[in-house]
């Protein structure tokens, strides 16, 4: 289920799957929510530790049991991923952090009159992931009112420093507030060039596009279909970026599909989950559990309820069935995508709906002069 | 909202505008989306007005002037007014609206979390009131959704300021000693939300006050935590499964 409570002065021991710098526990929790394997997190605010390297440290953790031992650590904040938390799942993070400089690659500097305007500029720049703004009272006069637009390889700051009269924050593109707009078109038989930032296996171009949308550095993608001439590249989804923000070239290519991230869409973003079920397809991955269930939809529900499950295969092979129930293979991988996609099998595959934000957890777990 | 500022898109995605279309159409109250098909508001919003037919509920909007005849709206399937609410009394000023069709959640339209039942231990220090109501006592409905940061006031302090009225444990008050920032007419039914541990919770429903933003006259809100049993009971679906779960 959904667990929203935070544990003050507590740190989860072990289970690390990733670490990064984040300005607060809530942003750390959001990164945990969107990480394919993270179930728990621990965050070290600046006040909690003397080690400059670990200040603002966000540690993403996994556990086979879903829990880890807590150790007392003054100032630390720990908690759970919000996977399975329905409408609370959002990559949107509006907070502005005063007295904090989030470091990264500074690719644009301009003078603006307020931190809100700086955030707006970041939101309206295709490459900007976060920003820092030097206020009117910054100690160096020449830097006052400077708005620095930034990015980093992982989408989070490469370092976070306490610095007076500096305010930092993140792009509001995940809030569907970008003024850039987006390309909804999917281009059949076209391959985009430029830099690959990641490679995953997906059953179709739409899953590829959603993964691109929620990847911090993906601006566009090319997907190689299951009939692509090179067998080892079938169902490969290449997540891409470029200096300009658009593909520098595209090549006509049979059995490829290309498109753009939808992160810059105005007013509506795709859900960060994939609800379609793929008949005749087998998703390979690390086995989490095998259970007998009645029907593929129940298999998907079972996967969704088991928080570590990322995807599943429901087998209809006679040897995998007894009476009306068949085997439901619950699986996971390092990146949340299948490690192998096979066609022509007797069965169906699909993904966990744990990141769907339309879940029915409508409310969180945890007279005189009338107006 | 008196002394407030403009909100931005998606900042308060649970805020809805309850509008009435008799001869003309007008905004009357705020409300809070608490589920795909449920809105929580104040009972007094329905005083003197028909139930169901004439109401239009707009969600996922920021600027009332953007509403046209083509703007989608929700209609009411059922209005559940608290059984102990009495017109012109401040007590039990709470009502649930069941929408005719469930709403999809987006970044601009999603529910607010409800507090734990009888939540008394949490100390809320970051509370906001939002609405399209008057910006002064004899004002007019605002176009852009307004927001204002207001501190909670203890019930003891609030009772001192309202000696002619009974401030019950099922009410919560918010305001500045010096006044200047408050909810006002047209904000009724809307949310008083507080951010705690990074999560927004619906602490109050805008209900009443002496004038608006007057010195030493805090706003009085229906305390949502005190009505959790009622909310959960009324939002049970026909198959007995709760449409929403209260915090553990």
């Amino acid at each position: 289920g959904c667990l929203t409570q935070l544990y003050e002065n507590a740190f989860f021991r072990g289970g690390d799957v990733a670490s990064m710098y984040t300005p607060n526990a809530q942003y750390c929790q959001m990164r945990c929510t969107f990480h394919p394997r993270c179930l728990l997190f621990s965050f070290l605010p600046a006040s909690s530790i003397n080690d400059m390297e670990k200040r603002f440290g966000c540690f993403l953790k996994d556990s086979v049991t879903g829990t880890l031992p807590k150790v007392h650590r003054t100032g630390a904040v720990s908690g759970h991923s919000l996977k399975q938390c329905g409408h609370q799942i959002s990559a949107c993070h509006r907070d502005i952090y005063k007295g904090v400089d989030m470091r990264g690659v500074n690719f644009n500097v301009s003078k603006v009159s307020s931190v809100e305007e700086c955030q707006k500029r970041c939101t309206s720049n295709i490459r900007c992931q976060f920003f820092s703004y030097a206020t009117q009272t910054f100690h160096k006069a020449e830097y006052r009112n400077n708005c620095l637009l930034k990015y980093s390889p992982g989408g989070t700051p490469t370092a976070i420093k306490v610095l007076s009269n500096v305010e930092s924050g993140f792009s509001l593109k995940p809030c569907a507030l970008s003024e850039i707009g987006c390309h909804m078109n999917i281009f059949q038989h076209l391959a985009f060039s430029d830099v690959d930032v990641a490679r995953v296996l997906t059953p179709d171009a739409f899953v590829c596009r959603t993964i691109c949308t929620y990847h911090p550095n993906c601006l566009f993608f090319t997907f190689y279909t299951n009939v692509w001439k090179i067998e080892s590249q079938r169902n490969v989804c290449l997540l891409k970026t470029s200096e300009s923000g658009t593909p520098s070239s595209s090549t006509p290519q049979e059995n490829t599909i290309s498109g753009y991230s939808l992160l810059t869409c105005k007013r509506t973003l795709p859900e960060p989950c994939h609800s379609k079920i793929y008949p005749g397809v087998d998703f390979g991955g690390e086995e989490l559990n095998v259970t007998f269930v009645k029907g593929v939809n129940v298999c998907q529900e079972t996967c969704t309820k088991m928080i570590r499950c990322q995807f599943f295969t429901y087998s209809l092979l006679p040897e995998d069935c007894k009476e009306e129930k068949c085997k439901c293979f619950l699986r996971l991988s390092m990146d949340g995508s299948p490690t192998r996609i096979a066609y022509g099998t007797q069965g169906s595959s699909g993904y966990s709906l744990r990141l769907c934000n339309t879940g029915d957890n409508s409310v969180c777990t945890t007279k005189t002069s009338t107006r | 909202i008196v002394g407030g500022t403009n909100s931005s898109w998606g900042e308060w995605p649970w805020q809805v505008s309850l509008q009435v279309k008799l001869t003309a159409q007008r905004h009357l109250c705020g409300g809070s989306l608490i589920g795909h098909q449920w809105v929580l508001t104040a009972a007094h919003c329905f005083d003197g007005l028909p139930l169901q037919d004439v109401w239009r509920i707009y969600s996922g909007i920021l600027n009332l002037s953007d509403i046209t005849k083509d703007t989608p709206f929700s209609q009411i399937k059922e209005i559940i007014i608290h059984q102990n609410y009495k017109v012109s009394e401040g007590n039990h000023d709470i009502a649930l609206i069941k929408l005719q069709a469930p709403l999809n959640y987006t970044e601009f339209q999603k529910p607010i979390c409800l507090p734990s039942k009888g939540d008394t231990s949490t100390i809320y220090t970051n509370c906001w009131v939002t609405g399209w109501g008057f910006s002064k006592e004899k004002g007019e409905i605002q176009n852009i959704l307004q927001k204002v940061n207001i501190p909670l006031v203890t019930n003891e302090e609030c009772q001192k300021r309202y000696q002619d009225y009974k401030i019950t444990q099922r009410m919560v008050c918010a305001g500045y000693k010096e006044g200047g920032k408050d909810a006002c007419k047209g904000d009724s039914g809307g949310p008083l939300v507080c951010k705690h541990n990074g999560m927004w919770r619906l602490v109050g429903i805008t209900s009443w006050g002496e004038g608006c933003a007057r010195r030493e006259q805090p706003g009085v809100y229906t305390k949502v935590a005190e009505y959790m049993d009622w909310i959960l009971e009324k939002t049970q679906s026909s198959d007995g499964k709760a449409q929403m779960q209260s915090p553990a």
Partner: antibody
Framework: EVQLLESGGGLVQPGGSLRLSCAAS????????MVWVRQAPGKGLEWVSY????????FYADSVKGRFTISRDNSKNTLYLQMNSLRAEDTAVYYC???????????????WGQGTLVTVSS | QSALTQPPTVSVSPGQTARITCSGN??????VAWYQQKPGQSPMLVIY???KRPSAIPERFSGSNSANTATLSISGTQALDEADYYC?????????FGGGTRLTVL
């Protein structure tokens, strides 16, 4: 066009009863708060009672509380005033009016009937 | 249940501005409506929500309300404006009328 037509007035003895009716047309009756206002001969207007659109809430002036009952039948577009224990001081022209009411703007009556005379005398 | 007080009579010369007052405790906090009633006729709404005019009412009629007094003003008064005028307010479920003012156009 909004029309309100009162009926049921007449001469009645003190302590007697009378039922006034108000037939409404030209608007969606079930959407509006309805009100009775009276005017004694040569005197000013005095509010008597009003009723919410659904009939779920009713309000009375102190002078008639416990003696008069307001009601409505939305299927017949009709408003009623049942008057019991009538007194000489209840003698007046009784007007039925359509009320515009909400908690923001309060109450006012934008359409009035022609009135029906009630005389309480022995 | 506070009372609303109006002067019994107001006289005005044709073409002049007539001002009829209505006073009550904290009346400025409430919204006031004004009704015109000519002999033998039903009352007619001329001002609502302090200052608003129904579409059929001429612009000569205006209203204001602050502190403890609401005022109905009729500019360029004409003979046909001669009537009784009533103020009305709403307070905690109670409808309150003023005692009425007879406007005489001299």
């Amino acid at each position: 066009e909004v029309q309100l037509l009162e009926s049921g007035g007449g001469l009645v003895q003190p302590g007697g009863s009378l039922r006034l009716s108000c037939a409404a047309s030209g608007f969606t009756f079930s959407w509006y708060t309805m009100v009775w206002v009276r005017q004694a001969p040569g005197k000013g207007l005095e509010w008597v009672s009003y009723i919410y659109p659904s009939g779920g809430a009713t309000f009375y002036a102190d002078s008639v509380k416990g003696r008069f009952t307001i009601s409505r039948d939305n299927s017949k577009n009709t408003l009623y005033l049942q008057m019991n224990s009538l007194r000489a001081e209840d003698t007046a022209v009784y007007y039925c009016a359509m009320g515009s009411y909400d908690y923001i703007w309060g109450f006012y009556s934008d359409h009035w009937g022609q009135g029906t005379l009630v005389t309480v005398s022995s | 249940q506070s009372a609303l007080t109006q002067p019994p009579t107001v006289s005005v010369s044709p073409g002049q501005t007539a001002r009829i007052t209505c006073s009550g405790n904290k009346l400025g906090d409430k919204y006031v409506a004004w009704y015109q009633q000519k002999p033998g006729q039903s009352p007619m709404l001329v001002i609502y929500q302090d200052t608003k005019r129904p579409s059929a009412i001429p612009e000569r009629f205006s209203g204001s309300n602050s502190a403890n007094t609401a005022t109905l003003s009729i500019s360029g008064t004409q003979a046909l404006d001669e009537a009784d005028y009533y103020c009305q307010a709403w307070d905690s479920s109670i409808v309150i009328f003023g005692g009425g003012t007879r406007l005489t156009v001299l």
